[in-house]
Interface confidence: low
């Protein structure tokens, strides 16, 4: 596969991953109440996210409440907020860096420098994935630990929410996409013949040997 194809595929995966990360960050379903044993009339499921908590009645009625004070939040929620938002912003920066290093753009002149810019974009997406993975795994660890903690009442136990799964899928896409971008950039630096389009010049006069200059041919 040519580097341009790797670049496009990598960028598409990273953009989808970025969208997934934004979705995971905003969704209130980082943890959901585990047990639904009660009367369907009054039964309710609690969702908790980074920014708000929601109570969903069995009737389908949902009531959400944005967390009032940042200082009142637990350390893990504050840290998860910072890391997730950081990852989203880093992905935004990575997008511009990747576009600047892309073969189809003219922000940076073609050559090794452009390939290095593209490589930087790929690395940034990899970092973005790793950065997002930290709060996701941290949160999951807390939920699982509390689920098996005998000091937490049965009715107060939570399970992993949809947002965590979306987040994990998003980080996987970011890291795979970032990896493809890095591969594409590496191909550019190591095999220029597979990357930048050849600029053909007008044919020269035949050489003394009668052969055409072969430098423009693979």
């Amino acid at each position: 596969m040519g580097s341009a194809a790797l670049e496009i595929l990598g960028l598409v995966l990273c953009l989808v991953g970025w969208g997934g990360l934004i979705l995971a960050c905003g969704l209130p379903m980082w943890q959901v109440t585990a047990f639904l044993d009660h009367n369907i009339v009054t039964a309710q499921t609690t969702w908790k996210g980074l920014w708000m908590s929601c109570v969903v009645q069995s009737t389908g009625h949902m009531q959400c409440k944005v967390y009032d004070s940042v200082l009142a939040l637990s350390t893990e929620v504050q840290a998860a907020r910072a890391l997730t938002v950081g990852a989203v912003l880093l992905a935004f920066v990575a997008l511009f860096v990747t576009l600047a290093g892309a073969q189809c753009t003219t922000c940076v002149a073609p050559g090794p420098a452009k390939a290095r810019v593209a490589l930087t974009g790929g690395v940034l997406y990899l970092l973005c994935g790793l950065l997002a993975l930290v709060p996701l795994c941290w949160f999951a660890n807390i939920v699982v630990r509390e689920f098996y903690d005998p000091s937490v009442p049965v009715s107060q136990k939570y399970e992993l929410g949809a947002a965590l799964y979306i987040g994990w899928a998003a980080t996987a896409l970011l890291m795979v996409g970032g990896g493809l971008l890095c591969c594409g950039a590496w191909v550019c630096t190591s095999r220029p013949d597979l990357s930048f389009p050849v600029k053909y010049s007008a044919p020269r006069r035949p050489t003394a040997t009668g052969d055409y200059d072969k430098k423009n041919y693979v």
Partner: antibody, heavy 120, light 112 residues
């Protein structure tokens, strides 16, 4: 009106077996966790076993003294709760109550009880 | 396991008198995340099944007369009957549902 009616109690010899039943009506049985609580003659209440709803994979819990001897089960289609009691001991003699775990996690409805007597 | 202790085991009272019975748990029943105490009180009249009176340590079950009041937090709880009536003759049990379910030994309310 919520009703829990126990049956199946009786006189059993030590090491014997029996199956206690509880017929539930007046509520959506399949979404509630259900329990068995017993009361020895002249004594206090002792929680015996719990079975959760289908949404919780029918998870079961037992008091240590009856683990490996008692089996709690349910049939949601019939709104029935069961307690299979095996390898009975004289100390299992008690009134056995079928109980619903209500919306506040505690026991909001109790049956009238069925008496199990273990004696040789 | 959480152990529940009730005192007194027997409480002779006169009709109209105010009574208080206590319940202690071997570990805190307060869950800080929701600020709820996982404790309930039940009344068992002679020859009858137990009946839920109070849950979350202080919330009266619907239909329970307001002379019954639950209070306390953490490990120490009380049930108060502001003015005892003859029909209150019963055994009162506290129960923790913080970690599975354990009952106290009961307090027998006897009318003098």
């Amino acid at each position: 009106e919520v009703q829990l009616v126990e049956s199946g109690g009786g006189l059993v010899q030590p090491k014997g077996s029996l199956k206690l039943s509880c017929a539930a009506s007046g509520f959506t049985f399949n979404i509630y966790a259900m329990h068995w609580v017993r009361q020895a003659p002249g004594k206090g209440l002792e929680w015996v076993a719990r079975i959760r709803s289908k949404s919780s994979n029918y998870a079961t819990y037992y008091v240590d003294s009856v683990k490996d001897r008692f089996i709690i089960s349910r049939d949601d289609s019939q709104s029935m709760l069961y307690l299979q009691v095996n390898n009975l001991k004289t100390e299992d003699t008690a009134m056995y109550y079928c109980v619903r775990e209500g919306n506040w996690d505690c026991f909001d409805y109790w049956g009238q009880g069925t008496t199990l007597t273990v004696s040789s | 396991d959480i152990v529940m202790s009730q005192s007194p085991s027997s409480l002779p009272v006169s009709v109209g008198q105010k009574v208080t019975m206590t319940c202690k748990s071997s570990q805190s029943l307060l869950y800080t995340s929701n600020q709820k105490n996982y404790l309930a009180w039940y009344q068992q009249k002679p020859g009858q099944s137990p009946k839920l009176l109070i849950y979350w340590a202080s919330t009266r079950e619907s239909g329970v007369p307001d002379r019954f009041t639950g209070s306390g937090s953490g490990t120490d709880f009380t049930l108060t009957i502001s003015s005892v009536k003859a029909e209150d003759l019963a055994i009162y049990y506290c129960q923790q549902y913080y970690r599975y379910h354990t009952f106290g030994g009961g307090t027998r309310l006897e009318i003098k």
